[in-house]
């Protein structure tokens, strides 16, 4: 590694993000036939552009906006699924309800679940050494300034009842400081949201507790309410249960609460 | 199954003050907020105000000033007091609790209380 | 505050019918709109919320629609329960405001 290289905090970039980016967009497109029109080598080109050449803690939304126009995707709004911290139990969701969609259900965050990457100033090299860690290094970093992108962009596209699915056994059930929270909540439309509806997912098998009665929720219904848009709290006590009840709802055991 | 039940006065001294006990079960008041309505043939449905489940009211302008909603939660109990009746305070009064957590509009209401102001 | 017309405060039906009552609001309310229905005596029962979703044990024969500033409550093949008062309620803003009641009334 030349001496030169600026040494992040964070992991680089993951290996191979270039074929991963074009294969997952392939793979998406087949999959997806209302999306069969989008051509994912312009797609490559334009995540490529956001962010090489450019000093990975100084990156702009506006950076993104070529991505942005490209994968451009309709979901129905009344059918999207936030979540914080809880991140595979809402896919495990939204693979059995499938008129459900989270934002790694669209084209974009699909592309990135789960990647890293960054470039370097004035150079046309991918990093794969490290990258800025949003919290030791910058927080206008390729990675953290593209998810905040496509979430407000997802937020902004939802409404009647938007749900959320927030995890019972972290210390802050709603963290301010989560993408939800920060990002999310803020771009709801109170003029197309009416209802936010969390479902707190609980941990412990014998956890009887009402969640709901969180400080942390309740101060997410007060930030909501602040706002204009009505606000639902759930507990969901057995997951699996829950999972079981959306994949078999005729279910008999799934009239009880779950 | 969910009901709320009021109870207070059905005749009022112009002037004077109405208070109204809305005793609820089959739901908790930690979980849902209760509205405050009355109906009357001049002025048809008027909605009075709201105390949320944390305890937090909400007043219609028009009557902020002589209106005050309380609860006891372990009692189950929602607590209407409204000051300084006038003839046209005249109504029947309800009590009504959310449909969800915290909406602004109701599914389960009490039967009501006829309230006449009159001397 | 935002005021809610109902435009007929009365209209005669037959059983069996369809029949739309209709509610405008001074200001758009942004689909913020229930619909209420009540018997003589009794208290207004939820038929409807967000100006489409039908309430848990509302029959299927009632609906709602519209947007912005114009709303409808439709009952297609009318029963005789159904021969009551409807009202709407916006909750776009504070202070919660009502239509003054449409009575439906037999022919």
């Known amino acids: 590694v030349p001496r030169w290289r600026q040494q992040w905090s964070g992991p680089g970039t993951t290996k191979r993000f270039p074929e991963t980016v074009l294969a997952r967009c392939v793979k998406y497109t087949e999959i997806h036939p209302e999306m069969r029109h989008v051509d994912c080598q312009s797609v490559w080109d334009a995540f490529k552009g956001a962010f090489i050449s450019k000093h990975p803690c100084n990156i702009t939304e506006e950076d993104y906006q070529p991505l942005m126009k490209l994968g451009t995707q309709t979901v129905p709004c009344n059918k999207i699924l936030l979540w914080s911290r809880i991140k595979d139990l809402a896919h495990q969701f939204t693979q059995v309800q499938r008129d459900m969609f989270t934002l790694e259900d669209t084209l974009l965050g699909y592309l990135a679940d789960d990647l890293t990457w960054c470039g370097e100033f004035n150079t046309s090299k991918i990093n794969y050494q490290s990258c800025p860690d949003w919290r030791k290094d910058c927080s206008n970093n390729p990675v953290s300034v593209f998810w905040k992108t496509v979430s407000r962009r997802f937020a902004e596209a939802a409404c009647d009842v938007v749900h959320v699915m927030l995890n019972g056994s972290r210390s802050k059930i709603f963290d301010k400081n989560s993408t939800f929270g920060s990002v999310e909540v803020h771009n709801l439309q109170p003029e197309k949201v009416q209802t936010l509806e969390a479902w707190v997912i609980h941990g412990g098998r014998e956890d009887s507790r009402d969640l709901c009665q969180d400080p942390t929720i309740k101060e997410l219904e007060s930030i909501i309410s602040k706002r204009n848009i009505q606000f639902s709290c759930k507990n969901i006590y057995r997951p699996d249960k829950f999972l079981q009840c959306v994949k078999n709802p005729e279910d008999s055991s799934c009239t009880s609460e779950i | 199954q969910v009901q709320l039940k009021q109870s207070g006065p059905g005749l009022v001294q112009p002037s004077q003050s109405l208070s109204i006990t809305c005793t609820v079960s089959?739901?908790?008041?930690?979980?849902?907020?209760v509205h405050w309505l009355r109906q009357s043939p001049g002025k048809g449905l008027e909605w009075l105000g709201v105390i949320w489940r944390g305890g937090s009211t909400d007043y219609s302008a028009a009557f902020m000033s002589r209106l005050n909603i309380t609860k006891d939660n372990s009692k189950s109990q929602v607590f209407f007091k409204m000051n300084s009746l006038q003839a046209d305070d005249t109504a029947i009064y309800y009590c009504?609790?959310?449909?969800?957590?915290?909406?602004?509009?109701?599914?389960?209401w009490g039967a009501g209380t006829t309230v006449t102001v009159s001397s | 505050d935002i005021q809610m017309t109902q435009s007929s405060s009365s209209f005669s039906v037959s059983l069996g019918d369809r029949v739309t009552i209709t509610c405008k609001s001074s200001e758009d309310i942004y689909n913020r709109l229930a619909w209420y229905q009540q018997k003589p005596g009794n208290a207004p029962r939820l038929l409807i919320s967000g100006a489409t979703s039908l309430e848990t044990g509302v029959p299927s024969r009632f609906s709602g629609s519209g947007s912005g500033k114009d709303y409808t409550l439709s009952i297609t093949s009318l029963q005789t329960e159904d021969v009551v008062t409807y009202y709407c309620?916006?909750?776009?803003?504070?202070?919660?405001?009502f239509g003054a009641g449409t009575k439906l009334e037999l022919k």
């Open positions: 009504a609790k959310t449909t969800l957590t915290r909406v602004w509009y109701c599914d389960v």
């Open positions: 309620q916006q909750y776009w803003n504070t202070p919660l405001t």
């Open positions: 089959g739901f908790s008041l930690t979980n849902y907020g």
